[in-house]
């Protein structure tokens, strides 16, 4: 079998809302993945599991099941959204994210994603990790090139 390549492209959008009473930030982060099937047979993408960390704390998790089928020598782009919550012991970040004097409230988040693929009854897991800047102060839609530019760490090979 030839390789199945997973490339984390970056953050596509981040939609923010606040709970003033709880001093909590809610960030819905949509990410983009490219999955390439270099084989001469179809491959099933069984699931994608993702998690987001801020300051070594997991702030959001997501799992997508029965996603798609990728044909021979084909590539598919998949978007997935991770709902994240910055609260409790990290509520000090609420001060930063809601401060009007700052116009771009960039925070560094660790994006982790694992793609499980299956073909002929065989499963394979491919993982990626990437640090990304995300603006916690306003709704943001990123250009994919811009998202690449925002990366501080290249994905693990």
């Amino acid at each position: 079998p030839r390789s199945i390549e997973v490339k984390y492209i970056g953050v596509k959008s981040a939609y923010v809302s606040y709970d003033a009473e709880k001093r909590t930030i809610y960030l819905n982060i949509t990410n983009t993945l490219n999955i390439t099937n270099n084989n001469y047979y179809s491959v099933e993408v069984e699931n994608i599991t993702a998690q987001v960390q801020f300051s070594k704390t997991v702030i959001g998790k997501a799992r997508l099941n029965n996603i798609t089928n990728i044909g021979p020598l084909d590539m598919k782009q998949i978007d997935y959204t991770v709902p994240t919550v910055i609260a409790e012991e990290m509520s000090y970040m609420y001060d930063f994210c809601t401060l009007l004097s700052i116009k771009v409230h960039n925070i560094v988040l660790m994006m982790q994603v694992t793609v499980t693929t299956a073909y002929f009854g065989h499963s394979e897991q491919i993982s990626q990790e990437r640090y990304q800047y995300v603006d916690c102060g306003r709704n943001t839609t990123y250009q994919l090139a811009q998202s690449e530019y925002l990366n501080v760490l290249q994905p693990q090979q």
């Epitope: 003033a20 001093r23 509520s91 001060d95 930063f96 009007l100 116009k103 943001t140």
Partner: antibody
Amino acid sequence: EVQLVESGGDLVKPGGSLRLSCAASGFTFSGYGMSWIRQTPDKRLEWVATISSGGRYTVYPDSVKGRFTMSRDNVKNTLYLQMSSLKSEDTALYYCARDNFYSYAMDYWGLGTSVTVSA
Amino acid sequence: DIVMTQAAFSNPVTLGTSASISCRSSKSLLHSNGITYLFWYLQKPGQSPQLLIYQMSNLASGVPDRFSSSGSGTDFTLRISRVEAEDVGVYYCAQNLELWTFGGGTKLEIK
């Protein structure tokens, strides 16, 4: 209903000190940044200070930096402005206002408290 | 500091007609994030300032849609489509791209 009520304004001599207070009600005070703005006798508006929701960050213009200190008590729902080394140009009506993180504006203002610096 | 410039008085307007108030900033208020950090406040006689417009063109809560605002990065106009007696007061433009600064205010004059 959002309400902001300033107090503490007075007549003070140059070089003197004064502490203004702003009592907030009608919203979750600890969830919002707050600002002080003053209106001079010629009706010009000048931003004086901003404090973040939890009091972690304060920002001042150069005109008051080192002389004014903004603070807050989120238990008492009260905002403060400690003013020292007062000058005649500090004479103004002082307003407190709520910072809105969605509009990026100061969306509610109090009625103000008057500070006069004169010998 | 960014300087905000306004005329002290508007051209006198008749009730029911439209009015325009202008404001100019010494630097573009358009941030690279696409937001223009320009605001309009109205101070009615004996009252504190009230927010009318935020981020150049958005109407604040409770503000009648007779009010509208437009502009480029440095030149801005507040329009009142049908002036009412309650619109009388001083209109201030303000920016917070780089900390807050206000214009000197424009007094709306009624004929």
